[in-house]
């Protein structure tokens, strides 16, 4: 239904707190360099304006679109060109081109310092003084570093943050209460960020149809008792919500997500028996809970998939009649039978089925041609299963840090031209798949591993797009989203690469490394490892292990020495010589 004033409508639906939070996220995601205070001022102005429209929908400018209102605010910022360069050119455009222009200027890797968490006492003091401002800072800092973060979900994480601080700041030992809890939220939020970025990439590169296919597969796995019409309705609504968030329409997105959660809770009988616990929660927790609800029990009497999609005499007729619907029912039927497959795998199978029908239905005897299609799925299923087994075995043998190093070597060999910081970030993230997925029950490993790896590789592709340096990476990133992970897995040593010359300063370390937190120490060592591989791309695992063990021993010795500086300056050059010899 059309509303006289869109901004008044959204303010009324969302309430002041969520409205302000979402506007702050929107501004922070568009203009990533502005300070919190600059954005907070804009948010207050927008909120005051929204209130005047609530009071009188006919008031001046209340009928303007949200894009127009928000865009005008952003374009009125002083020194826009000095701070943002060509983004200022967006302000010469009219809507909807102006908003599209803002979206194109979102930076997936902004040059902002890492978000440092203050120490516990200081956090609790500022939280107690002004919880609203404290949470505003959190939203601003996360949103500007993650310009595609799923806005309603960021409100949920802010709420989690709030609850943790409320609880822990009342404790005697604030630090030991806060650290593990906030680390947990941070880890979940980072995973949420890469997953959502993948969804936006799918939407941006391949359109709504591709995202809807993803949603059908995912929802069918989770709700195997829901019929195809119900799954289609949910997938359509979910596609709309994600399209809005990916497009910067955060108020609409949050509002529609709340509507979808409401619909699901009102229609549990036709969706799933597992929703009640989620539906008893307040809004943000409810929507979050529904997004990761456990799979419903699969119906016991599902017929073999072949009946309708291979053996039925009217396969080609049904396909001709309505291709998307027929392929959609195939994806639905296959997915509801396979909660143990990744969505990426299910989409690859659906793509294979579609290609088979395209080819076979044009032949004189289609049934003879497509009759073996399900058997042809086997290699497509075996490949990720082997990937999971091999990698989880390696993870169990090496632990997370060792597993990250193994991946770092592998990926540096595949794409040695990629910058070392990007390779280290990617390997660390890819390596976390072990901790995240390999400890799960067997039937949950594959979907966890592959869908997580796909999201991380999507980030690799986004970073590589900014400065394309590797033909290998370009090749894998140019294909469809679901083919990326198999493409990266299949890459071998890049034979075209000319090894980097050995620079002693790359492997020279100082005593300041000793006081770094464990994570930073690991990154330093992994940076050195990537550089070693760039110097000797064909070094054996044994050679690299020798060098890294020697390096670890050197750090341990010098960091325990009474005169650390002397130890580093005398032993460092010896280490460099030994490294060169070991890799010769």
């Amino acid at each position: 239904e059309a509303h006289k004033s869109e901004i008044a409508h959204r303010y009324n639906d969302l309430g002041e707190q969520h409205f302000k939070g979402l506007v702050l996220i929107a501004f922070s995601q568009y203009l990533q360099k502005c300070s919190y205070d600059e954005h907070a001022k804009l948010v207050q102005e927008v909120t005051d304006f929204a209130k005047t429209c609530v009071a009188d929908e006919s008031a001046a400018n209340c009928d303007k679109s949200l894009h127009t209102l928000f865009g005008d605010k952003l374009c009125a910022i002083p020194n826009l060109r000095e701070n943002y360069g060509e983004l200022a050119d967006c302000c010469t455009k009219q809507e909807p081109e102006r908003n599209e222009c803002f979206l194109q200027h979102k930076d997936d890797n902004p040059s902002l310092p890492p978000f440092e968490r203050p120490e516990a006492e200081a956090m609790c003091t500022s939280f107690k003084e002004n919880p609203t401002t404290f949470m505003g800072h959190y939203l601003h800092e996360v949103a500007r570093r993650h310009p595609y973060f799923y806005a309603p979900e960021l409100l949920y994480y802010a709420e989690q943050y709030n609850e943790i601080l409320t609880q822990c700041c009342a404790e005697a030992d604030k630090e030991s209460c806060l650290t593990p809890k906030l680390d947990g939220v941070k880890e979940k939020a980072l995973v949420s960020s890469v997953r959502q970025r993948m969804k936006c990439s799918s939407m941006q590169k391949f359109g709504e149809r591709a995202f809807k296919a993803w949603a059908v597969a995912r929802l069918s796995q989770t709700f195997p008792n829901a019929d195809f019409a119900e799954i289609t309705k949910l997938a359509t609504d979910l596609t709309k919500v994600n399209k809005e968030c990916c497009h910067g329409d955060l108020l609409e997105c949050a509002d529609d997500r709340a509507e979808l959660a409401k619909y699901m809770c009102e229609n549990q009988a036709t969706i799933s028996s597992k929703l009640q616990t989620c539906c008893d929660k307040p809004l943000l927790k409810k929507a979050h809970c529904l997004s990761e609800v456990e799979h419903d029990t699969m119906p016991a009497d599902l017929p073999a998939i072949a009946a309708d999609f291979v053996e039925d005499q009217e396969v080609c007729k049904n396909y001709a009649e309505a291709k998307d619907v027929f392929l959609g029912t195939f994806l639905y039927e296959y997915s509801r039978r396979h909660p143990d497959y990744s969505v990426s795998l299910l989409l690859r199978l659906a793509k294979k089925y579609e290609a088979t029908l395209e080819k076979c239905c044009a032949e004189a005897n289609p049934p003879a041609c497509y009759g073996t299609v399900l058997a042809e799925f086997q290699p497509l299923v075996e490949e990720p299963k082997n990937l999971v087994k091999t990698n989880c075995d390696l993870y169990e043998k090496l632990g997370e840090y060792g597993f990250q190093n193994a991946i770092l070597v592998r990926y540096t060999q595949k794409a040695p031209q990629v910058s070392t910081p990007t390779l280290v970030e990617a390997a660390r993230n890819l390596g976390r798949v072990g901790t995240k997925c390999c400890t799960l029950p067997e039937d949950q490993r594959l979907p966890c591993v592959e869908d997580y790896l796909s999201a991380i590789l999507n980030r690799v592709c986004l970073l590589h797009e900014k400065t394309p340096v590797s033909e290998h990476v370009t090749k894998c990133c140019s294909g469809s989203l679901v083919e990326r992970r198999p493409c990266f897995s299949a890459l071998t040593v890049d034979e075209t690469y000319v090894p980097k010359e050995f620079k002693a300063e790359t492997f020279t370390f100082h005593s300041d490394i000793c006081t770094l937190p464990e994570k930073e120490k690991q990154i330093k060592k992994q940076t050195a490892l990537a550089e070693l591989v760039k110097h000797k791309p064909k070094a054996t695992a044994e050679q690299l292990k020798t060098v890294m063990d020697d390096f670890a021993q050197f750090l341990d010795t010098c960091c325990k020495a009474a005169d650390k500086d002397t130890c580093f300056s005398t032993e460092g050059p010896n280490l460099v010589t030994r490294c060169k010899d070991a890799l010769a």
């Epitope: 005499q313 009217e314 396969v315 080609c316 007729k317 396909y319 001709a320 009649e321 395209e358 239905c361 044009a362 032949e363 004189a364 005897n365 289609p366 049934p367």
Partner: nanobody
């Protein structure tokens, strides 16, 4: 919506000829193999002939081989069946179908071979 409309049937004497047509709409005609199937009075469906989307490959049931010719005009989205040397046992309702399968999906056209 997929539509298949058969025509060209009628009464013919043994040894005579008929040409059946099937006008197709609602789908990308050249992307699909097409077939003719028939149903004699009181009998089940019987596959007669199939042709690939491009028209390059054709298949025939042994009972009609050498007498019937299947063809298509992709520009006109029409399927044909040229039937020569007709016999009384060819009497049946003839249906055109998508995808080379024996599936009854339209009204058909009646062919009666009788003296």
């Amino acid at each position: 919506k997929v539509q298949l409309l058969e025509s060209g049937g009628g009464l013919v004497q043994p040894g005579g000829s008929l040409r059946l047509s099937c006008a197709a709409s609602g789908f990308t005609f050249p992307s699909f193999g097409m077939s003719w199937v028939r149903q004699a009075p009181g009998k089940g469906l019987e596959w007669v002939s199939s042709i690939s989307g491009s028209g390059s490959d054709t298949l025939y049931a042994d009972s009609v081989k050498g007498r019937f010719t299947i063809s298509r005009d992709n520009a006109k989205t029409t399927l044909y069946l040229q039937m020569n040397s007709l016999r009384p046992e060819d009497t049946a309702v003839y249906y055109c179908t998508i995808g080379g399968s024996v599936s009854k999906s339209s009204r058909g056209t009646l062919v009666t071979v009788s003296s």
